[in-house]
C-alpha cells in the first residue's frame, strides 16, 4: 500500500505522458487521477514505466473499480495485464474478441500463464461455447490450447468450429479428447469427397470407431503408419488383415517396423497366422492354424 500524501504544487498530472516516469511512487499515487488514467490507458504502454510504477497505476485502477475493470479499460491494459492476478481477472466481463486478442498479444511467445488461462476461461464461459473465431484466435496464440481442455469442456465446441483446427493443434491431445472431437469433425466434414475428407479427418482419427475405419478401408486412403499407430487399440483389433491392407495401401509394409508397438502388436496377436503370412512381411505372433478363437467377452455378455 502507498501512503496517502498530498500532491506537491504544480505536479498534478493533466494527462498521461512521459513526464510521469520521473515521478516517485508516492507522487504517482498522489498526483495521477484514477479516472484520467482509466480514460488514457492506451498511452501507458508507450511510456517506459518501472514495475514499481506499474504497481501504483494498478492500485489506482483497483480503487476506482473495486468490482472489476470495465472492458474499455481492459482492452488497453497492455503490459499492465501482466500485473493482474487470476483473482483480478475473475471480476472481469470480457466479451470482445478484440480485447482478448490485445491481451494475448501481451503474453505472446510465453507459456500460457495462470492469468491467460483465467482470461480465456472467463471469455469462453461468457460466450457459452467455443465458436470458430475464438478457436482461431486461441490456437493462433497457443497451438496446444485445444488439447489443454478437458473432454467436458471440449463438448461445448460446435462442429462448425472444427474447420478452424489445424493438425498441429491436436499434437498433444490424448485419446479421451479425440473421442469427443472426432464425431464433431466427422459431422463438420461430412459433405467432402473421399480424398479431401481423409486429409481433413486424418488428425482426428485417434477417436474413430471400428466401423468408420472399415468404411475408410474401402476408399483407397493409403493411411500412413504414424496415423495408424495413433488409432484406438480397441478400434483396430476387430479389423481383418484384408481391411488393414486396404486401409494402409502401399504403407502396409510399415507394419513390420512397428510389429512390437501397440496397436500393431495387439492386432497381430488377434489375427490368424495364415492371414498375416499373405502380407509377406514376416509378421509373427498370430493365431496358429487349427486353433479356435473364443471371444469370452461376447460369451459373458450373452449369459
Amino acid at each position: 500500500e502507498v501512503e496517502k500524501t498530498a500532491c506537491p504544487s504544480g505536479k498534478k498530472a493533466r494527462e498521461i505522458d512521459e513526464s510521469l516516469i520521473f515521478y516517485k511512487k508516492w507522487e504517482l499515487e498522489a498526483c495521477v487521477d484514477a479516472a484520467l488514467l482509466a480514460t488514457q490507458m492506451d498511452r501507458v504502454n508507450a511510456i517506459p514505466f518501472t514495475y514499481e510504477q506499474l504497481d501504483v497505476l494498478k492500485h489506482k485502477l483497483d480503487e476506482l473499480y473495486p468490482q472489476g475493470y470495465p472492458e474499455s479499460v481492459i482492452q488497453h491494459l497492455g503490459y499492465l495485464f501482466l500485473k493482474m492476478s487470476p483473482e483480478d481477472i475473475r471480476k472481469w466481463n470480457v466479451t470482445s474478441l478484440e480485447t482478448l486478442k490485445a491481451l494475448l498479444e501481451v503474453n505472446k511467445g510465453h507459456e500460457m500463464s495462470p492469468q491467460v488461462a483465467t482470461l480465456i476461461d472467463r471469455f469462453v464461459k461468457g460466450r457459452g461455447q467455443l465458436d470458430k473465431d475464438t478457436l482461431d484466435t486461441l490456437t493462433a496464440f497457443y497451438p496446444g490450447y485445444l488439447c489443454s481442455l478437458s473432454p467436458e469442456e471440449l463438448s461445448s465446441v460446435p462442429p462448425s468450429s472444427i474447420w478452424a483446427v489445424r493438425p498441429q493443434d491436436l499434437d498433444t491431445c490424448d485419446p479421451r479428447q479425440l473421442d469427443v472431437l472426432y464425431p464433431k469433425a466427422r459431422l463438420a466434414f461430412q459433405n467432402m469427397n473421399g480424398s479431401e475428407y481423409f486429409v481433413k479427418i486424418q488428425s482426428f482419427l485417434g477417436g474413430a470407431p471400428t466401423e468408420d475405419l472399415k468404411a475408410l478401408s474401402q476408399q483407397n486412403v493409403s493411411m500412413d503408419l504414424a496415423t495408424f499407430m495413433k488409432l484406438r487399440t480397441d478400434a483396430v483389433l476387430p479389423l481383418t488383415v484384408a481391411e488393414v491392407q486396404k486401409l494402409l495401401g502401399p504403407h502396409v509394409e510399415g507394419l513390420k517396423a512397428e510389429e512390437r508397438h501397440r496397436p500393431v502388436r495387439d492386432w497381430i496377436l488377434r489375427q490368424r497366422q495364415d492371414d498375416l503370412d499373405t502380407l509377406g512381411l514376416g509378421l509373427q505372433g498370430g493365431i496358429p492354424n487349427g486353433y479356435l478363437v473364443l471371444d469370452l467377452s461376447m460369451q459373458e455378455a450373452l449369459s
Epitope: D171, A226, M229, K230, G254, L255, A257, E258, R262, G282
Partner: antibody, heavy 119, light 108 residues
C-alpha cells in the same frame, strides 16, 4: 530445420542413474518414433530401444530391458532416456535418432551425449 | 540376434579409385530392411543409404548400394577425400535392430 539437441557430457558414479534429454525441433515429435543408440569408444553402434511419442509406448533391446526407460514429454517436444545401475561398461556416447514411423532407418540423429561412469 | 559382419574393418583408397564395402548377415535380411550410415570422427552418424539401394538426401551419386539375402555392399565409384569416414550397415528385419562393426575408410 529438423534438429535433435542433446545435453552436455555427464560424469556419474557407478550404481547411479543418468537421464539424458533430447529436444526435438523443426517437426512434430508425435509423428515419428524416437530411437536411442549407444556407441562405446572406438566401437560400433548398439540399438537400445525406441518410443512412440504419441502414446509413450516403448520397446527395448533385451540387453537394456529393466535398466533403460524411454519417455517423452510431448508438450516440450523432448524425449528422455534414463539408464540405471550404471557400470564402467555404460561409458559411451548416447544418441537419440528420429525414425519415420513405419520404417526402420534413422533419418536424423541427435548431437550425442557422452556419459562417463567413474568413481 | 542377427549379426552383421563388415569387411574389411579398415581400408584405404586413393582418390578416383573404386571402393566396395561389404556387409554379411548371419541370416537372411529382406533388402527393404537394410541401410547404411556414415560417421566422421567427433560427429553423429548420418543416414547414407536406405532400403539397400536408395541414397539419402544430399548423398553424391558416386555412391550406390546393392545386395540381397545375406550379402550386401556399398560402392563408391570414384573415391574422394570427403568420403573418408566410418561406414556402418544396419538391419531392422528382426529384433533387436543391429549394426555391423563398421568399416573405417581412409584416403591414401
Amino acid at each position: 530445420e529438423v534438429q535433435l539437441q542433446q545435453s552436455g557430457p555427464e560424469l556419474v558414479k557407478p550404481g547411479a542413474s543418468v537421464k539424458i534429454p533430447c529436444k526435438a525441433s523443426g517437426y512434430t515429435i508425435t509423428d515419428y518414433n524416437m530411437d536411442w543408440v549407444k556407441q562405446s569408444r572406438g566401437k560400433s553402434l548398439e540399438w537400445i530401444g525406441d518410443v512412440f511419442p504419441y502414446n509413450g509406448d516403448s520397446i527395448y533391446n533385451q540387453k537394456f530391458e529393466g535398466r533403460a526407460t524411454l519417455t517423452v514429454d510431448k508438450y516440450s517436444s523432448t524425449a528422455y532416456m534414463e539408464l540405471r545401475g550404471l557400470t564402467s561398461e555404460d561409458t559411451a556416447v548416447y544418441f537419440c535418432a528420429r525414425r519415420k514411423t513405419g520404417t526402420g532407418y534413422f533419418d536424423v540423429w541427435g548431437t550425442g551425449t557422452t556419459v562417463t561412469v567413474s568413481s | 540376434q542377427l549379426v552383421l559382419t563388415q569387411s574389411p574393418a579398415i581400408m584405404s583408397a586413393s582418390p578416383g579409385e573404386k571402393v566396395t564395402l561389404t556387409c554379411s548377415a548371419s541370416s537372411s535380411v529382406s533388402s527393404t530392411y537394410l541401410s547404411w550410415y556414415l560417421q566422421k570422427p567427433g560427429s553423429s552418424p548420418k543416414l547414407w543409404i536406405y532400403s539397400t539401394s536408395n541414397l539419402a538426401s544430399g548423398v553424391p551419386a558416386r555412391f550406390s548400394g546393392s545386395g540381397s539375402g545375406t550379402s550386401y555392399s556399398l560402392t563408391i565409384s570414384s573415391m574422394e577425400a570427403e568420403d573418408a569416414a566410418s561406414y556402418f550397415c544396419h538391419q531392422w528385419s528382426s529384433y533387436p535392430y543391429t549394426f555391423g562393426g563398421g568399416t573405417k575408410l581412409e584416403i591414401k
